[in-house]
């Protein structure tokens, strides 16, 4: 008995469907045993679906009832499953196990990793610190959603809408602006991006003199 998944990693967008491939080969014609899919996480493992060759009955894990379909060719050699309505909770490693009582090797398995893709949500831009000349401030940018985790980059524009270089690396967040001055004034755009999307937010920086600090 041999079991294989044709891909190590699968990527699929949230809300869509994905087929996790699994095929098995055996010389046994009298099939008695199981096909089982488990979801393996560091914190726990849970059953996705179990199919009994003899009773032809399925058992579905709670989170997968009405959302998982086993291949129509399960009795032949195709143990693949399709998961519908993907959510972020479906991220993880899935293990396909096939056991046949009359096969010498009895049980074999293979794995596939599922990465559910979600474009970044519109990031929140905010300023930490007082916008007073001479102060240091931090510009933060964060997307609540995004898979894979979004990458953040910054661009800066002066009052004349001309892009200007940033004195520190433009990627990552937060962006630290030291000893701010009127030269720092303008607006800053944070771009949050991953493999499936891009979103941005902007912040206006207008340093005021210390005398205006109340």
């Amino acid at each position: 008995l041999t079991v294989e998944t044709t891909q190590d990693i699968l990527r699929a967008a949230r809300g869509r469907s994905v087929t996790l491939p699994c095929t098995y080969n055996t010389y046994v014609s009298d099939r008695e045993g199981f096909i089982q899919w488990d979801k393996l996480l560091r914190s726990q493992t849970e059953r996705v679906v179990t199919w009994n060759f003899v009773t032809k009955k399925y058992i579905y894990g709670n989170r997968y009832e009405n959302r998982v379909r086993v291949s129509n060719d399960a009795e032949l050699s195709n143990a693949s499953i399709t998961i519908d309505q993907l959510t972020m909770d479906d991220n993880g490693t899935y293990e396909c196990s096939v056991s046949l009582m009359s096969d010498q090797d009895v049980n074999a398995k293979s794995r596939v990793r599922l990465l559910v893709l979600v474009p970044p949500s519109k990031p929140d831009c905010s300023i930490q610190g007082e916008m007073v000349i001479g102060n240091n401030i931090q510009l933060t940018c964060h997307s609540a959603e995004g898979s894979p985790s979004p990458q953040y980059s910054w661009k800066s524009y002066n009052a004349q809408n001309q892009q200007r270089p940033l004195t520190q690396p433009v990627s990552g967040e937060p962006l630290l602006l030291k000893n701010i001055s009127t030269e720092t004034a303008g607006y800053y755009i944070c771009t949050s991006s991953n493999d499936v999307g891009i979103e941005s937010c902007n912040i206006t920086v207008a340093p005021r003199p210390p005398s205006m600090n109340i």
């Epitope: 199981f34 849970e46 894990g61 056991s99």
Partner: antibody, heavy 118, light 107 residues
């Protein structure tokens, strides 16, 4: 035929360590998840730990997390449970059990007694 | 963790009696429920898996039913060798958990 033969139990002082072994035969050991289950004297069964067939996913009961380590050596067809910082409440008969798809815990070892006492 | 509660904790019955043991899960476990029999000084033995499937070699007087949170083990006609302790166990999600056991004694 499938066999699970256990060894390594005994008397140990609180705070001490012990390593249990479970030697498997009669099946392709490397294809199966394996488990440890224990039973305190006069009490019920308590699942202790599980290890995936490839040895990269390990799970533990809260009562032993951080103190016990499950491992396997497929070349030797053996399952292990390293028990550290032992407490009186760890006193129990420990069983290894095979976990098959569809039929979990279908074969069990004979059990080995671990006594934690000063 | 999913809690498993068995009832009764013990029962007295005679040979030939019909015996029913129940098991309740603290949350739905679909049909990932197994029943084991254990005799003193011995390792547990798998009787029923997937709530209602009889393990190979187990007499047909044993049967299981239920899904979701409520499950039942029935022995249709108790035999002398059936006096033992019975445990339910969920295998839906780790940590796998057992019920506290039901001891079936001779009346």
């Amino acid at each position: 035929q499938v066999q699970l033969v256990q060894s390594g139990g005994g008397l140990v002082k609180p705070g001490g360590s012990l390593r249990l072994s479970c030697a498997a035969s009669g099946f392709t050991f490397s294809n199966y998840n394996m488990n440890w289950v224990r039973q305190a004297p006069g009490k019920g069964l308590e699942w202790v730990s599980s290890i995936s067939s490839s040895g990269d996913f390990m799970y533990y009961a809260d009562s032993v997390k951080g103190r016990f380590t499950i491992s396997r050596d497929d070349a030797k067809n053996s399952l292990y449970l390293q028990m550290n910082s032992l407490r009186a409440e760890d006193t129990a008969v420990y069983y290894c059990a095979r976990e098959g798809p569809g039929t979990p815990f279908d074969y069990w070892g004979q059990g080995t007694l671990v006594t934690v006492s000063s | 963790a999913i809690q498993m509660t068995q009832s009764p904790s013990s029962l007295s019955a005679s040979v030939g009696d019909r015996v029913t043991i129940t098991c309740r899960a603290s949350q739905s476990i679909s049909s990932y429920l197994n029943w084991y029999q254990q005799k003193p000084g011995k390792a547990p033995k798998l009787l029923i898996y997937a709530a209602s499937s009889l393990q190979s070699g187990v007499p047909s007087r044993f049967s299981g039913s239920g899904s979701g949170t409520d499950f039942t083990l029935t022995i249709s006609s108790l035999q002398p060798e059936d006096f033992a302790t019975y445990y339910c166990q969920q295998s839906y999600r780790t940590p796998y958990t057992f019920g506290q056991g039901t001891k079936v004694e001779i009346k």
